[in-house]
């Protein structure tokens, strides 16, 4: 079989602060050096990129400065964390990986984690 | 709109070069691989060329393999296909598609016709 | 390199009637890779069916896909005088990238 497995948790429950963090596996085929992490919010039928991030297997993940994602790498695993989220951002976040060298390129898409991000509460004025 | 154009197709004899070109817009190209796909005459669909994001990566079809170069430029939102030692069996079509952000070619260009006889 | 084979080749088909496409891969292909593509004479392919059985953004409801591993389906539940054209099968899981060679549904 040529096709690349993606395994993520199917479902994941934000913190207070708006964090959530998951883990993103692949099963590779081959032998990657350079592999893209890309994760994706899928609402309805549209998806829209949320961040994406290029690593040499061995070195860490790197994403832009101005990304809400961090993560870090080990072997065929990847740990992402997802930061700023509000109740609106609840959706099925989907991990993509690819595999793009050395040759073949390989494609792995999640079956999705849906995370759900409830807003924290006001506090309430205080009577002292 | 989102839509991506093609140009640069001609009639160029067996041995010469053409440039094609792929103007995106409506979208953030740099988020998207691009792959250039060609169908001959009356024939079905054969890519033939892939590059990634950031236009470090590039894969072709064996039947182009050595003659044909693609390349992007993101601050200008292109995408080329650079062909040389054209042979007849290079005539077709070709478009320029989006590799979609689940894997499939979710955008297409209207194609460049591209002829290669004497 | 996968090989992509679709069957028949030319299927004949009155409007208003069901039309069923195979397409049967050399290997396993996980169905997250699988797509379907429309292309009427002097067009370019249009995406109908990706992940083996996700419509595409505007697809109407009447062309649906299945399978998985080596073997997947498109149908065409009552085909409107629209949808005679060709249709391709492609695999994106790997490179390189490939098409089946195309099944031309005509009006009977």
């Known amino acids: 079989c040529k096709a690349m497995h993606v395994a993520q948790p199917a479902v994941v429950l934000a913190s207070s602060r708006g964090i959530a963090s998951f883990v993103c596996e692949y099963a590779s085929p081959g032998k990657a050096t350079e592999v893209r992490v890309t994760v994706l919010r899928q609402a309805d039928s549209q998806v829209t990129e949320v961040c994406a991030a290029t690593y040499m297997m061995g070195n860490e993940l790197t994403f832009l400065d101005d990304s809400i994602c961090t993560g870090t790498s080990s072997g065929n695993q990847v740990n992402l964390t997802i930061q700023g989220l509000r109740a609106m951002d609840t959706g099925l976040y989907i991990c993509k990986v690819e595999l793009m060298y050395p040759p073949p390129y390989y494609l792995g898409i999640g079956n999705g984690t849906q995370i759900y991000v409830i807003d924290p509460e006001p506090c309430p004025d205080s009577d002292f | 709109e989102v839509q991506l154009v093609e140009s640069g197709g001609g009639l160029v004899k067996p041995g010469g070069s053409l440039r094609l070109s792929c103007a995106a817009s409506?979208?953030?190209?740099?988020?998207?691989?691009m792959h250039w796909v060609r169908q001959a005459p009356g024939k079905g669909l054969e890519w033939v060329s892939f590059i990634s994001y950031d236009g470090n990566h590039k894969y072709y079809a064996d039947s182009v393999k050595g003659r044909f170069t693609i390349s992007r430029d993101n601050a200008k939102n292109s995408l080329y296909l650079q062909m040389n030692s054209l042979r007849a069996e290079d005539t077709a079509v070709y478009y320029c598609?989006?590799?979609?952000?689940?894997?499939?070619?979710?955008?297409w260009g209207q194609g460049t016709m591209v002829t290669v006889s004497s | 390199e996968i090989v992509l084979t679709q069957s028949p080749g030319t299927l004949s088909v009155s409007p208003g009637e069901r039309a069923t496409l195979s397409c049967r891969a050399s290997q396993s292909v996980g169905s997250s890779y699988l797509a379907w593509y429309q292309q009427k004479p002097g067009q370019a392919p249009r995406l109908l069916i990706y992940?083996?059985?996700s419509r595409a953004t505007g697809i109407p409801d009447r062309f649906s896909g299945s399978g998985s591993g080596t073997d997947f389906t498109l149908t065409i539940s009552r085909l409107e005088p629209e949808d005679f054209a060709v249709y391709y099968c492609q695999q994106y899981g790997s490179s390189p990238w490939t098409f089946g060679q195309g099944t031309k549904v005509e009006i009977k």
């Open positions: 992940g083996a059985f």
């Open positions: 409506g979208f953030t190209f740099s988020s998207y691989t």
């Open positions: 598609a989006r590799g979609g952000h689940l894997g499939p070619f979710d955008l």
